[in-house]
Interface confidence: medium
């Protein structure tokens, strides 16, 4: 999906209202310096691409993020503020429903959510000239 035409400011507002707090809740008890941020993004569409990938694509050691509250709210925000996003996600959603529900907070998941926080931070505050 090409995130170029999303309403970035509306997504930012959704993040500030709820998603950010859910990420903090998920990471509670973890030190802010515990993980090195290795994932980066250069502009807002790129940040959303990386955010979508880390949030919804299962990775080795962390297969359960898509069911978390912050992930569901992220999905809702993208569906509302990115034209045509919902349509591209139907197949992905059906595939997700077939997987067993597994709510395990692994260290790998914590590391992944730490990466997500950095990506969201970058998305929300690109340097002023990029706005």
């Amino acid at each position: 999906y090409d995130f170029t035409n999303c309403d970035f400011e509306k997504i930012k507002a959704a993040y500030l209202s709820t998603i950010s707090k859910d990420l903090i809740t998920y990471m509670s008890g973890t030190k802010s310096t515990e993980f090195n941020n290795t994932v980066s993004c250069s502009n807002r569409p790129h940040c959303l691409t990386e955010i979508q990938s880390l949030t919804f694509n299962p990775t080795a050691g962390c297969a359960s993020l898509a069911k978390e509250m912050f992930a569901m709210k992220t999905k809702a925000a993208l569906a509302i503020w990115c034209p045509g996003y919902s349509e591209t996600q139907i197949n992905a959603t059906q595939a997700m429903k077939k997987r067993r529900k597994r709510k395990v907070t692994t260290n790998k998941c914590l590391e992944q959510v730490s990466q997500l926080q950095g990506l969201w931070r970058r998305f929300n505050r690109p340097l002023l000239k990029q706005q």
């Epitope: 509306k10 507002a13 500030l16 802010s32 310096t33 941020n37 730490s114 505050r125 002023l128 706005q131």
Partner: antibody, heavy 120, light 111 residues
Framework: EVQLVQSGAEVKKPGSSVKVSCKAS????????MHWVKHAPGQGLEWIGA????????SYNQKFKDRATLTVDKSTSTAYMELSSLRSEDTAVYYC?????????????WGQGTTVTVSS | EIVLTQSPATLSLSPGERATLSCRAS??????????MHWYQQKPGQAPRLLIY???NLGSGIPARFSGSGSGTDFTLTISSLEPEDFAVYYC?????????FGQGTKLEIK
């Protein structure tokens, strides 16, 4: 503990340059925008510019664009602000500041300030 | 650039009194229903300290006697009952539009 520690006071001649450092600790330096703010005697606060350590991208207040250079050294989690062609009106306290965690656009952590005096 | 005008320039009050500081922007600092206006306190020889973010949210560790309100172009910082340590300079700041700007400050002094 999250903190920013700046280099010591400087006394410079007009026309010379000064480079102020700001060492970060207690947070993931590469994912926060780092800003520099000027506070001249008897004046208000003035934004100089910002840098994103993740890729070195910068944004400047047009007023300082020609004379200020912002850089970072990710290996030491240090931000730098170099000001060239110094003049008397550059006499001020210079602060580095971290932009907030969420992206609200406020400064939640500040350095202690570096006094730069420009005098012949 | 957005110009922030703070008033009054100096406010003389006594401990226990209520302080009302104003910040007016030359154009709206709102975006998608959020007001990107922040307030700082600065004491002599110290770095500024965040008081209020996004118009009305209390910064970490800031006493409840501080509050912020407003949207669009008009914003207010209120200190409900002044403590001796509240006498300082207060700045508003916007980051909605390039370049980021601060107000010129309001000095709150003991009467």
């Amino acid at each position: 503990e999250v903190q920013l520690v700046q280099s010591g006071a400087e006394v410079k001649k007009p026309g010379s340059s000064v480079k102020v450092s700001c060492k970060a600790s207690g947070f993931t330096f590469s994912t926060y925008n780092m800003h520099w703010v000027k506070h001249a005697p008897g004046q208000g606060l003035e934004w100089i510019g910002a840098i994103y350590p993740g890729n070195g991208e910068t944004s400047y207040n047009q007023k300082f664009k020609d004379r200020a250079t912002l850089t970072v050294d990710k290996s030491t989690s240090t931000a730098y602000m170099e000001l060239s062609s110094l003049r008397s009106e550059d006499t001020a306290v210079y602060y580095c500041a971290r932009e907030d965690d969420y992206g609200e656009g406020y400064f939640d952590v500040w350095g202690q300030g570096t006094t730069v005096t420009v005098s012949s | 650039e957005i110009v922030l005008t703070q008033s009054p320039a100096t406010l003389s009050l006594s401990p226990g009194e209520r302080a009302t500081l104003s910040c007016r922007a030359s154009e709206s600092v709102d975006n998608s229903g959020l007001s990107f206006m922040h307030w700082y306190q600065q004491k002599p020889g110290q770095a500024p300290r965040l008081l209020i973010y996004r118009a009305s949210n209390l910064g970490s560790g800031i006493p409840a006697r501080f509050s912020g309100s407003g949207s669009g172009t008009d914003f207010t910082l209120t200190i409900s009952s002044l403590e001796p340590e509240d006498f300082a300079v207060y700045y508003c700041q916007q980051i909605n539009t390039d370049p980021l700007t601060f107000g010129q400050g309001t000095k709150l002094e003991i009467k």
